[in-house]
């Protein structure tokens, strides 16, 4: 997996004027890292995970950094045309890696209204666009917008690359990051489906990074993938991550089946607890 | 006592179909998870087949999947294996086998039928 | 498709001697190997599940060992009804059998 730092612009407009405010999201390696949710923007760390790598230190570069980005896409949103009444967002997300080989890469996108209309590689210069009629539409407004000012495309977008991989590798250096592992914590519960039936979840949570393999097993071989429901690997919050996976089983063959886990090369089994059902009600739809 | 013992072997032509049948004793066949594994003449073993105690999870080997079927009827207590487009390197001894139901178990098979030859002939 | 590589394919042996067959994991299977025995015109016999653990009423002079992608079955000392074929299984990935190792009278 590559290091990554991804940033997540947001600014809305009500009745074709652009409001004030906007709503920005910074990522660390996939996890929630910075957030600038206010009027006035501060920076401020997701968690004490962020603050380990940030340090002892304020957020100023980081405040300063993100308003001007906020300032920058607030233009862009009032220079779409046609904007419809009520209300409409314009949204940047910007995201550069560090591979494992040291080589980079670096790109950024635009959404309206959640629509991805624009694209640009940030090395190369590149940009690219879906082929639908709207977002073309969009873009060539956006990109004739950026190109108006000159000096700002090649000022201010042809350095988004550097400084965004110069930050990463300014976060990447507190040594918090840097290629960690956290095993999960893994349990199994169980619940009354149906008549004769119950679903058993097992959860893992707390595990960094984020690739895991959870399956449940039966005498050792693996359900089919349908058989099974998975959930999204998501952030918990701490700097790790949290996801689960359910099957419907026969009441009275619980021992026959384990749940399966693997994570960066370590791997376990977890079988159903035996005895009374602890929850009623199931989440299997 | 526990055995499997299967039938419906015998000679077919290429392109051919064949049914195989394995009947339980001894045991309810309802809760195991099944197999069919193959030997042919002076070789060694190959899964062909698994499908499980509830019928949700069914494998094949890539050199039958698209023409074998695997099924079970566990009200008559019996493994099926439906062969179509049957070719010569289907010639074998077919084995129809039982997952273990041990705590622990890592997909081990206890307890195996004696065996039905199939022939394929061009 | 995880593959299994047993070695020898065949090897010559005396009643009483210690023997070790390998089977190889084309990627790590973790313990999900199991051994069987099989003799001429016979159907295989479990022996070792889980990687080590012994099937119920098979003798203790077979063991099973590794984890991964290297795995042991040792006989500690050969019995005469202990010459025949035998293979290795893994349920990790889909099942696949090994090619089998013979054992046969020096």
């Known amino acids: 997996e590559p290091h990554s730092l991804r940033y997540n612009l947001t600014v809305l407009s009500w009745d074709g004027s652009v409001q004030s405010g906007f709503l920005t999201e910074v990522h660390l390696d996939g996890q929630p890292f910075l957030r600038c949710d206010r009027q006035k923007c501060r920076a401020k760390p997701q968690g004490q995970w962020a603050e380990d790598v940030l340090g002892n230190k304020t957020w100023d570069r980081e405040t300063r950094d993100l308003t001007g980005n906020g300032k920058d896409l607030r233009m862009t949103l009032a220079h779409i045309k046609d904007q419809k009444e009520g209300l409409h967002s314009l949204q940047e997300i910007r995201v550069c890696e560090i591979h494992e080989d040291n080589s980079t890469r670096s790109s950024q996108h635009f959404y309206y209204d959640g629509e991805l209309f624009l694209s640009q590689n940030l090395e190369t210069k590149e940009w690219t666009m879906p082929q639908s009629s709207r977002a073309q539409t969009l873009a060539m407004n956006v990109r004739n917008f950026l190109k108006e000012d000159a000096m700002k495309t090649k000022t201010h977008y042809h350095a988004m690359h550097a400084d965004c991989l110069q930050e990463l590798r300014r976060y990447l250096k507190s040594g918090v990051v840097l290629r960690r592992t956290v095993p999960p914590m893994v349990n199994v519960t169980r619940s009354e489906a149906s008549e004769g039936n119950i679903t058993v979840t097992c959860r893992a949570s707390g595990f960094y990074p984020w690739n895991i393999t959870l399956s449940w097993r039966q005498d050792g071989v693996s359900l089919s993938h349908d058989t099974q429901q998975w959930g999204d690997v998501l952030p918990d919050g701490n700097g790790t991550y949290q996801t689960w996976v359910a099957t419907r089983i026969c009441q009275g063959e619980e021992q026959r089946f384990t749940c399966y886990m693997e994570h960066s090369g370590n791997h376990s089994t977890h079988p159903v607890p035996s005895g009374k059902v602890l929850v009623l009600q199931s989440h299997w739809q | 006592q526990v055995q499997l013992v299967e039938s419906g072997g015998g000679l077919v032509q290429s392109g051919g179909s064949l049914r195989l049948s394995c009947v339980a004793s001894?045991?309810?066949?309802?809760?195991?998870?099944m197999n069919w594994v193959r030997q042919a003449p002076g070789k060694g073993l190959e899964w062909i087949s698994y499908i499980n105690s509830r019928s949700n999870t069914i494998y094949y080997a890539d050199s039958v999947k698209g023409r074998f079927t695997i099924s079970r009827d566990n009200a008559k207590k019996s493994l099926y294996l439906q062969m179509n487009s049957l070719r010569d390197e289907d010639t074998a001894v077919y084995y129809c086998?039982?997952?273990?139901?041990?705590?622990?178990?890592?997909?081990?098979?206890?307890?195996w039928g004696q065996g039905t030859m199939v022939t394929v002939s061009s | 498709e995880t593959t299994l590589t047993q070695s020898p394919f065949s090897l010559s042996a005396s009643v009483g001697d210690r023997v070790t067959i390998t089977c190889r994991a084309s990627q790590s299977i973790h313990n999900y190997l199991n051994w069987y025995q099989q003799k001429p015109g016979k159907a295989p016999k479990l022996l070792i599940y889980a990687a080590s653990s012994l099937q119920s009423g098979v003798p203790s002079r077979f063991s099973g060992g590794g984890s991964g992608t290297d795995f042991t079955l040792t006989i500690s000392s050969l019995q005469p009804e202990d010459f025949a074929t035998y293979y290795c299984?893994?349920?990790?990935?889909?099942?696949?059998f090994g090619g089998g190792t013979k054992v046969d009278i020096k």
């Open positions: 299984q893994q349920s990790y990935n889909a099942l696949t």
């Open positions: 001894g045991f309810t066949l309802s809760r195991y998870s």
């Open positions: 086998a039982r997952v273990s139901d041990i705590t622990g178990n890592t997909g081990a098979f206890d307890i």
